[in-house]
Interface confidence: low
C-alpha cells in the first residue's frame, strides 16, 4: 500500500517539510504531486517522468518545491497557506494509478507575548483585574504563571477567552505577582516579560512602638507609628485628642508627669480614602509599677547530651514587659542551638551539649523595674559508648 509521511508533521513557518513516500511500486511511468485531497490538474505541483528523469512544474508550483527520484517532495520556506493535504498519484506501468494522501500543519514562530491589564492599580478587596495575553493567535495554547509558578487552584482566579484572559476576583495585597503569560503551539513557545500589580490597600490598624507604657520623668519619649499601607500612609499624632504634628515619629524630650495621657496615631491613605487609629496610654511616674517575680519551668531538668532537647519557659502575669535569659551570668542565646520564641518566653536548646549544664534564670523588666526568677539547674548526662561487636585481632 502506497503511503506518505510528513517529516515533521508540525512545521514552523519558514522551515521545510519533507513528504516521504513509502512502498513506492517498482514498475512506474511517473508520478505527480497535487495540493489537496484529490487529483486536480489545476492544483498540480510537479510531475516527474521516470524515463527522462524530468520534473515538470504544475500550476500550483511556487518554486519552493523539489521532487526526488524516490517520489518524496521537499517544500522549503513554508507558510501557513501551505497547511493542508497533499496527494501523490503514481502512474504504474500497467496503467493502474495508485494514490496516497498526506498532510502537515504549519504553525507560526510565536512572537514574544505581552500582558495587557484593565487595571494596574486595583484596590484591595474591591477591584477585579483582568489580564489579557497579547496577541490573539490561532492554534495557540495560553499558559499563565504567578511568581514563576503555574496557576494555583483558587476561586479568585478565573480563566476565560480560551485561557487568554486571567481574571483576579477581588484582589489582595498578596496578588502583586509577578505575572507572566506563555504562548505555545506545536513548534514554538514564548513567554512575556513579567508584569506586577500595584495593589492599593490599607492602612491597616497602626502599631505604636515601643510597647512601653511607664516612663520616668526626665526621660525622652520617642514613639513611632507604622501601618501597612500602599501607597504609604500619612501619619499624624494627637495627645489627649489634640493634634500635635503630621509625622510618623513623635519625640518629646525630658518628659514630666504632665506628659501622661492618651497618645493617638492616625494613619490615612489618600488613595483608598481609609483611616485607622491606635491609642496608647503613656504614664510618666516616679512610682515603680513593680514587676512580679517570674516563674521558670523546664520540660526536663536531666537530659542526655547530644540526644535530647529541652524547653525552658518563663511565666509572668505582668503585661508590657520584656524577657531576657541568663546562663552562668551570661546573656542568651549564646549558640546556634539556642532559640527564643513566643516573645522570648521560651528558650529551646536542641540538642543539649555538655557545656549547657548549669544554672539558668530569666528576668522580666519594663522601663521602670525588673525582677528575676529563681534559678533552675540543668543536668546533662552522657551515656557510655556501646561496645563494638566482632572479633578482636590476634
Amino acid at each position: 500500500q502506497l503511503t506518505t509521511e510528513s517529516m515533521p508533521f508540525n512545521v514552523a513557518e519558514g522551515k521545510e517539510v519533507l513528504l516521504l513516500v513509502h512502498n513506492l511500486p517498482q514498475q512506474l511511468f511517473g508520478y505527480s504531486w497535487y495540493k489537496g485531497e484529490r487529483v486536480d490538474g489545476n492544483r498540480q505541483i510537479v510531475g516527474y517522468a521516470i524515463g527522462t528523469q524530468q520534473a515538470t512544474p504544475g500550476p500550483a508550483n511556487s518554486g519552493r518545491e523539489t521532487i526526488y527520484p524516490n517520489a518524496s517532495l521537499l517544500i522549503q520556506n513554508v507558510t501557513q497557506n501551505d497547511t493542508g493535504f497533499y496527494t501523490l498519484q503514481v502512474i504504474k506501468s500497467d496503467l493502474v494509478n495508485e494514490e496516497a494522501t498526506g498532510q502537515f500543519h504549519v504553525y507560526p514562530e510565536l512572537p514574544k507575548p505581552s500582558i495587557s491589564s484593565n487595571n494596574s492599580n486595583p484596590v484591595e478587596d474591591k477591584d477585579a483585574v483582568a489580564f489579557t495575553c497579547e496577541p490573539e493567535t490561532q492554534d495557540t495554547t495560553y499558559l499563565w504563571w504567578i511568581n514563576n509558578q503555574s496557576l494555583p487552584v483558587s476561586p479568585r482566579l478565573q480563566l476565560s477567552n480560551g485561557n487568554r484572559t486571567l481574571t483576579l476576583l477581588s484582589v489582595t495585597r498578596n496578588d502583586t505577582g509577578p505575572y507572566e503569560c506563555e504562548i505555545q503551539n506545536p513548534v514554538s513557545a514564548n513567554r512575556s516579560d513579567p508584569v506586577t500589580l500595584n495593589v492599593t490597600y490599607g492602612p491597616d490598624t497602626p502599631t505604636i512602638s515601643p510597647s512601653d507604657t511607664y516612663y520616668r520623668p526626665g526621660a525622652n519619649l520617642s514613639l513611632s507609628c507604622y501601618a501597612a499601607s500602599n501607597p504609604p500612609a500619612q501619619y499624624s499624632w494627637l495627645i489627649n485628642g489634640t493634634f500635635q504634628q503630621s509625622t510618623q515619629e513623635l519625640f518629646i524630650p525630658n518628659i514630666t508627669v504632665n506628659n501622661s495621657g492618651s497618645y493617638t496615631c492616625h494613619a490615612n491613605n489618600s488613595v483608598t480614602g481609609c483611616n485607622r487609629t491606635t491609642v496608647k496610654t503613656i504614664i510618666v511616674t516616679e512610682l515603680s509599677p513593680v514587676v512580679a517575680k517570674p516563674q521558670i519551668k523546664a520540660s526536663k531538668t536531666t537530659v542526655t547530651g547530644d540526644k535530647d532537647s529541652v524547653n525552658l519557659t518563663c511565666s509572668t502575669n505582668d503585661t508590657g514587659i520584656s524577657i531576657r535569659w541568663f546562663f552562668k551570668n551570661q546573656s542568651l542565646p549564646s549558640s546556634e542551638r539556642m532559640k527564643l520564641s513566643q516573645g522570648n518566653t521560651t528558650l529551646s536548646i536542641n540538642p543539649v551539649k555538655r557545656e549547657d549544664a548549669g544554672t539558668y534564670w530569666c528576668e522580666v523588666f519594663n522601663p521602670i523595674s525588673k525582677n528575676q526568677s529563681d534559678p533552675i539547674m540543668l543536668n546533662v548526662n552522657y551515656n557510655a559508648l556501646p561496645q563494638e561487636n566482632g572479633l578482636s585481632p590476634g
Partner: antibody
C-alpha cells in the same frame, strides 16, 4: 439570615410598564452582584439580567435588551427591574437572586420567593 | 431551545443513584464554572452545586457534581422521595455575555 423579598408584580397590558423591587436583608448588599431570573408558567428558568456590586457592570439577556432595565440602590439595600414595552412572552414569575462572585463568574446562592408578572389584554 | 442541554426527565427508586447530564460548548461549560439548582414544586430554586463540584453548606453529600470538557453532570445517590424536583444546570456564556440555564430535568422518585 439572608432574605430577598420581591414586590411590584401584577397584571399589565401589552406595551405597558411595571417596576419590580427586591428588598435585601441579612447581608451586606453592596458587596454582592444581583440578578433577575424569570420562569414562565410551566417552563424552565431564564436569566434576565445581572448588575455588579457597585452598579458599574450590567448585562442583559438578548430577549429583554432595550426593554428591561436593572438598577440598584445600595443605600436602600434594594434591587430594581424597570419593565417597559411589555409583551405576552414576558409573563413569568420574576426572582431576584444573589451572586456571591461579584458578577465575574455568576451563580446564585440565595433566591427570593418571586413575584408574578402577567402581561395580558 | 436552551443553550445548555439537559434530559427533560429522569427517574429512580429510593436508594438508587441517578445522574443528570448537562451538555454545552467551549463558550460556556468548557471555559466557565457550572452550577446546579434544585427547584422543589411550588418553591424558589435552591443552589445545589457550584464551581462544578462544590457543595454549599447544608447540602447533603448525596449530591455531587462533575465536569469534563463541555459537559457536566449531577449525581444523586441514595435517592429519597424528597429529592423529587426540577434540576437545572447553569453557566456563564462568553459568547452571549450572559448566564444560561439548561432546560431543566424533572426527577421522579418511583414507588
Amino acid at each position: 439570615e439572608v432574605q430577598l423579598l420581591e414586590s411590584g408584580g401584577g397584571l399589565v397590558q401589552p406595551g405597558g410598564s411595571l417596576r419590580l423591587s427586591c428588598a435585601a436583608s441579612g447581608f451586606t448588599f453592596s458587596n454582592y452582584a444581583m440578578s433577575w431570573v424569570r420562569q414562565a408558567p410551566g417552563k424552565g428558568l431564564e436569566w434576565v439580567s445581572v448588575i455588579s456590586h457597585g452598579g458599574g457592570s450590567i448585562y442583559y439577556a438578548d430577549s429583554v435588551k432595550g426593554r428591561l432595565t436593572i438598577s440598584r440602590d445600595n443605600s436602600k439595600n434594594t434591587l430594581y427591574l424597570q419593565m417597559n414595552s411589555l409583551r405576552a412572552e414576558d409573563t413569568a414569575v420574576y426572582y431576584c437572586a444573589r451572586d456571591p462572585t461579584k458578577g465575574y463568574a455568576p451563580l446564585f446562592d440565595y433566591w427570593g420567593q418571586g413575584t408574578l408578572v402577567t402581561v395580558s389584554s | 431551545q436552551s443553550v445548555l442541554t439537559q434530559p427533560p426527565s429522569a427517574s429512580g427508586t429510593p436508594g438508587q443513584r441517578v445522574t443528570i447530564s448537562c451538555s454545552g460548548s467551549s463558550s460556556n461549560i468548557g471555559n466557565n464554572y457550572v452550577s446546579w439548582y434544585q427547584q422543589l414544586p411550588g418553591t424558589a430554586p435552591k443552589l445545589l452545586i457550584y464551581a462544578d463540584s462544590r457543595r454549599p453548606s447544608g447540602v447533603p453529600d448525596r449530591f455531587s457534581g462533575s465536569k469534563s470538557g463541555t459537559s457536566a453532570s449531577l449525581a444523586i445517590s441514595g435517592l429519597r422521595s424528597e429529592d423529587e424536583a426540577d434540576y437545572y444546570c447553569g453557566a456563564w456564556d462568553l459568547s452571549l455575555n450572559g448566564y444560561v440555564f439548561g432546560g431543566g430535568t424533572k426527577l421522579t422518585v418511583l414507588g
